[in-house]
């Protein structure tokens, strides 16, 4: 017997889809070797309509689509627009048509419902609101109005003009009359229930010169919407409920066992623990919809999702949903970088960022994830030179190492840079990947001096010591600016006294500022880097000022000024101007995006999620 | 939560057919497939049939031992989902189990089912 598994029979009407599963055992050999899904002829043979190689037949042109899942073991046929031409008996398989590796999968496709026996039919997706139209004639238009549903052999009433309302409707049910000029009445039904689908008959008049008008009602459960997405990659689920449920709370939930379905985000300001730090929702439109972005997804993040609207911002029978299929690809095209940084107050921290290779020229950003309400990333820092002001000296966005990876560095860290960070470029959206800085006890591993006064046409010598550990790394200086960090030449001094236990290969490497000029004020950073891979920092402010005393400025450690968690900027330091993003696709189509820089900079906590790929501030 | 309750077993001879039935009641509007199990004397509960939904589109699927014999198919009005079995034989003997399930990403692994009935006997005797 084939190990192939699939469904036998599968039944649809007339222009609706279906999306066909097929199971294998999920070896090297079946994840790679090719899928396809053929029809069989009355002789025997299989033509191939799709296969996973890329062929698709004309007859399924535009409207079909094979996608493999290897690490479930499993591939799917999405055939949309279905006609009763597509009834017949079909074969999904693994390697060549003629060979045993396949299930026989019988596709029946019905007409689709008609208006049969002047029966109106009304097609309704579950939550969403139906309106049964009912014409009558002048001589009952004085009369009683009525709704009935047939249940079993029986019409039960569901409301009439009387103010009668069943129990079962309650609170998502009226009946309006049009004005005198029109001879019809309509019923309106809210937050349809799957249980509300079926026979309904209206009547105008109970006598046998009533007006009756029957009414079919099917209530369509959302046809989950497959999402692929790679591990530590990003997803958005665009949420478009109507405008009927604008004012409603929205909700992002994810199924589990039984009938729960966890409230992932909600509009009500809750967010599952799973999820800090790694996911927004986008302010919604005035017509009701919004998104709501994953990213650093997980191989648990799999699953189906449901976005919905309901005062409790939670799944009740009757809330209007979509729904989604979310799988994760393990085989990702992203690369594994940490999702943990760690860093010491006072010290620096370099990440890395991934992107798509693709899109070298594309613009990178560094954003501040914020849990407030419903989370928001303001950004710090583009490619393109802008830095937010309060974290001018202190941050720089660097396109090395290049080829699918940038670096950020941020040093003078304090307690209140522990929290979740995201990468980003205004090209593939998918592409977002977070990252949490944790600040930890511990001491930096560069040591400077403080804040630094240089005089006007003198020398300014500068010294930065490395500890051992940093014997094999390049060491540098360089001068800070919004589009990152200009080397400078430095004098290698020999080997440092700063550190206790060290040894010879210490190093004091110092920079000098030869007649030093106004324009030589500014922030100087000195730190170590491996090829292209940055390591840590330190920072340093030069102020420039008149001359006082001839000679040259020899600064030591011990004249540094305030600690670096103390440091404050000096409020004459230049502001960037707090420009706007005009990119519409940074946060996928949010159309908000102009006050994602804002200048609000609250204090965070530093929230542990548990991830087990971390690395310390001077590692890469 | 999502009540199931089956009915529909007996006692038969072999050559003979029987019609399960499966009522499900309560928050059955998060389900989006039903199926069948069973468990013959000393042995584990294996997957029969199942069926899944999504709009007016079905999913039948079916364990290798009962194809052509046995048909599931589901009322949608009644929330019922019923098993024709045709041709009983004696090693159909088993306790029937009803199951449903909010997440099916495999209809034949018995962990992908919420929901459980009590169960119906099926005899069939030679």
């Known amino acids: 017997k084939s190990p192939i598994f699939g469904p036998e029979e599968v039944n649809s009407v007339e222009g609706n889809s279906v999306s066909i599963t097929c199971y294998y055992p999920p070896t090297s050999v079946n994840r790679h070797t090719r899928k396809y899904w053929c029809r069989q002829g009355a002789r025997g043979g299989c033509i191939t309509l799709i296969s996973s190689e890329g062929y698709v037949s004309s007859k399924y042109a535009g409207r079909a689509n094979l996608t493999n899942f290897p690490e479930n073991g499993t591939f799917v046929v999405n055939i949309a627009q279905l006609s009763q031409d597509d009834s017949g008996r079909y074969k999904c398989g693994l390697g060549i048509n003629s060979r045993g590796l396949s299930f026989d999968v019988s596709l029946e496709v019905s007409q689709g419902p008609g208006l049969l026996n002047d029966t109106k039919v009304y097609t309704v997706d579950l939550g969403r609101t139906v309106t049964i139209n009912c014409p009558f004639k002048t001589e009952n238009a004085q009369k009683r109005k009525s709704l009935y549903k047939q249940i079993g052999l029986y019409p039960v009433l569901v409301i009439d003009s009387s103010g009668y309302v069943n129990p079962n409707y309650t609170g998502r049910i009226r009946l309006d009359i049009q004005g005198t000029g029109q001879l019809l009445f309509s019923v309106v039904i809210n937050q349809l229930r799957l249980s509300d689908a079926g026979q309904y008959l209206c009547q105008a008049g109970d006598d046998s010169n009533s007006n009756k008008k029957n009414a079919d009602l099917q209530v369509l459960k959302p046809e989950p919407e497959l999402v692929y997405e790679d591990l530590r990659g990003s997803v958005t689920f665009h949420c478009a409920l109507g405008p009927e449920v604008a004012n409603v709370a929205k909700f992002l939930c994810r199924q589990s066992s039984g009938e729960n379905c966890d409230v992932v985000v909600n509009t009500l300001g809750k967010r599952a623990p799973a999820f800090e730090g790694r996911i927004l929702l986008n302010p919604q439109d005035k017509d009701g919809s919004f998104s709501v972005v994953i990213t650093g997804l997980r191989k648990e993040d799999a699953g189906r999702y449901l976005c919905g609207a309901h005062s409790d911002g939670q799944l009740q029978e009757g809330s209007p949903i979509q729904a989604w299929q979310l799988f994760v690809n393990e085989e990702s095209t992203i690369p594994r970088s940490p999702t943990v940084v760690k860093g010491v107050a006072g010290g620096s921290v370099a990440v890395l960022c991934p992107y798509n290779r693709k899109e070298s020229k594309s613009i990178k950003y560094w954003c501040l994830w914020e849990g407030a309400q419903n989370g928001r990333c303001p950004l710090l820092v583009d490619s393109e030179g802008w830095v937010k002001a309060q974290y001018e000296g202190r941050l720089s966005l660097l396109e090395e190492p290049g080829n699918g990876t940038f670096t950020v560095i941020l040093n003078q860290l304090t307690s209140r840079d522990a929290g979740f960070y995201w990468c980003l470029t205004n090209g593939d959206t998918l592409w977002r990947t977070t990252v949490e800085i944790k600040i930890i006890e511990g001491e930096p591993n560069l040591k400077v001096p403080g804040n630094v006064t240089a005089v006007l046409g003198e020398t300014l010598k500068v010294p930065c010591h490395f500890p051992c550990k940093f014997s094999s790394y390049e060491k540098y200086w360089c001068k800070w600016n919004n589009t990152g960090c200009q080397a400078l030449p430095s004098q290698d001094e020999g080997p440092s006294k700063a550190f206790v236990n060290c040894d010879e290969n210490s190093r004091l490497v110092s920079l000098t500022l030869n007649l030093v000029t106004r324009a030589d004020e500014g922030w100087y950073w000195c730190g170590v880097k491996q090829g292209h891979f940055y390591g840590e920092t330190a920072a340093v402010y030069v102020a420039v000022e008149e001359r006082k005393a001839a000679g040259s400025r020899d600064v030591s450690l011990a004249k540094a000024d305030a600690a670096p968690d103390e440091k404050v900027l000096d409020s004459g330091f230049r502001e960037i101007e707090n420009k706007a993003i005009q990119d519409p696709r940074l946060f996928a189509e949010e159309k908000a995006v102009a006050d994602t820089r804002d200048q609000a900079d609250g204090s965070r906590a530093s929230v542990d999620s548990g991830s087990s790929e971390e690395q310390g501030g001077s590692s890469r | 939560q999502v009540q199931l309750v089956e009915s529909g077993g007996g006692l038969v001879q072999a050559g003979d057919s029987l019609r399960l039935s499966c009522a499900a009641s309560?928050?059955?509007?998060?389900?989006?497939?039903m199926g069948w199990f069973r468990q013959g004397p000393g042995k584990e509960r294996e997957f029969v049939a199942t069926?899944?939904?999504?709009?007016?589109?079905?999913?039948?699927y079916y364990t290798d031992s009962v194809k052509g014999r046995f048909t599931i198919s589901r009322d949608n009005a009644k929330n019922t989902v019923y098993l024709q079995m045709n041709s009983l034989k004696p090693e159909d003997t088993a306790v029937y189990y009803c199951?449903?399930?909010?997440?099916?990403?495999?209809?034949?692994?018995?962990?992908?089912?919420?929901?459980w009935g009590q169960g119906t006997q099926v005899t069939v005797s030679s």
């Open positions: 069926i899944t939904w999504s709009g007016s589109t079905n999913y039948k």
């Open positions: 199951a449903a399930s909010t997440v099916l990403t495999d209809p034949r692994r018995l962990n992908e089912y919420d929901y």
């Open positions: 309560g928050r059955t509007f998060t389900t989006y497939g």
